[in-house]
């Protein structure tokens, strides 16, 4: 890995190498300055593997609301607007980090958690299983 | 919003409502128990809107490595294996939370940061702009 020279102005901590419990400032800094979120908002409908977004809410998690994609069909939409079952719609998934309140219901104590979310769908050529 | 009854066993904190600085345990709990990540690992190649994955590394961020998808073509792959420019490959983007070391180079002090990442690509019907 890359060794980072330690900043002498860091808060005190017992473990100087890789901390297990750290301080996190929840004032979110948003780096997404050059993007137009509206541009991608209709892809779910225009895609050949369209999807719907479902709201997943959990007050014990931060962020408490996550949107999950579910592919509408097993096949993909062809040029005529019909579902073509020679192709497969599949979810594109990503592991993301969230904060889980620990102990439960605590406002200022969390644990990092990895969850798998489905972000959208893509159309793929099926895997052909050859029977011997 | 949902009011959560406060757990009496919570660590002390000055702000009882919505903390700006919290304690986070970095021992990651992985909730992805029922998934097989290998199943989706070849979608980038089998998709009609294939993509390449680029490694984005930043030692001041946690996680330090994030993989970014970049669509291979402007169009989509048709049944003959050629690029069809009557359709568009577009990135599916998602806002994710990461931890940014703050002050810089500190091992135990972070700030939450939102970044936009491209997870994969999907094939969409183009928006047709009619000229008056």
């Amino acid at each position: 890995g890359i060794t980072i020279p330690r900043n002498p102005g860091c808060p005190n901590s017992e473990d100087k190498n890789f901390p297990r419990t750290v301080m996190v400032n929840l004032n979110i800094h948003n780096r997404n300055t050059n993007t137009n979120p509206k541009r991608s908002s209709d892809y779910y409908n225009r895609s050949t593997s369209p999807w719907n977004l479902h709201r997943n809410e959990d007050p014990e998690r931060y962020p408490s609301v996550i949107w999950e994609a579910k592919c509408r069909h097993l096949g993909c939409i062809n040029a005529d607007g019909n579902v073509d079952y020679h192709m497969n719609s599949v979810p594109i998934q990503q592991e993301i980090l969230v904060l889980r309140r620990e102990p439960p219901h605590c406002p200022n104590s969390f644990r990092l958690e990895k969850i798998l979310v489905s972000v959208g769908c893509t159309c793929v050529t099926p895997i052909v299983h050859h029977v011997a | 919003g949902i009011t959560i009854p406060r757990n009496p066993g919570c660590p002390n904190s000055e702000d009882k409502n919505f903390p700006r600085t919290v304690m986070v345990n970095l021992n990651i709990h992985n909730r992805n128990t029922n998934t097989n990540p290998k199943r989706s690992s070849d979608y980038y190649n089998r998709s009609t809107s294939p993509w390449n994955l680029h490694r984005n590394e930043d030692p001041e961020r946690y996680p330090s490595v994030i993989w970014e998808a970049k669509c291979r073509h402007l169009g989509c792959i048709n049944a003959d294996g050629n690029v069809d420019y009557h359709m568009n490959s577009v990135p599916i983007q998602q806002e994710i939370l990461v931890l940014r070391r703050e002050p810089p180079h500190c091992p135990n002090s972070f700030r939450l940061e939102k970044i936009l990442v491209s997870v994969g690509c999907t094939c969409v019907t183009p928006i047709v702009h009619h000229v008056a």
Epitope: N45, N52, L53, H54, R55, N56, E68, A69, K70, C71, R72, H73, L74, G75, V83, Y85, N88, S89, V90, P91, Q93, S118, C121, V124, P126, I127, V128, H129 | N34, T35, R39
Partner: antibody, heavy 124, light 113 residues
Amino acid sequence: QVQLQESGPGLVKPSETLSLTCTVSGFSLPSHSVSWIRQPPGKGLEWIGIIWNNGGTDYNSAFKSRVTISVDTSKNQFSLKLSSVTAADTAVYYCARNMYITDYYYENYFLDAWGQGTLVTVSS
Amino acid sequence: DIVMTQSPLSLPVTPGEPASISCKSSQSLLFSENQKNYLAWYLQKPGQSPQLLIYWTSTRQSGVPDRFSGSGSGTDFTLKISRVEAEDVGVYYCQQSYYTPYTFGQGTKVEIK
């Protein structure tokens, strides 16, 4: 508990539009999709169409040109409209909830809760 | 449209005895990406609306007794009742949810001998 209740006129004249309402309770509309199914007297079940949680629809192509499914979230109501009806549209019409499975990344077309059904007769 | 063919169309049964219903699809219901078969079974009791018994070929819906079991893959599927009870009478339907429109079998009427 989960409940779905169909309502509407029991008699419709040929060439007119059949209009039915499905009032639901006991589940979250933003999570679940709802389908309409019909059953002609003494016959089997026929899927008419679905309205997804976001208001999008998908119809059986046999009905496509004359069916409309919509939702009024504020009233917890779904509606079915079938235009230009004939005697062949006489049936018991059901609304049913599409199953929602967490950690499953496709819309689900299994129907895990049904209304009691309403008989619509097309006759002059 | 996918044709779902059930047999038999009528099944007289004796309480306590096993029963079996077959359902054949005109196309495979096995999705290669997740190896799931998109087939469900419903029971419509006399004067009632249908109720979901089994989905994905063999997963029992919550509250369904374990005497009901489903099996099969591809185009051939079976619903078995290990020991028929009087309350099991009605019409059983299979349904495919792979291809739109989502179609049902013509139904199998189970009645007590």
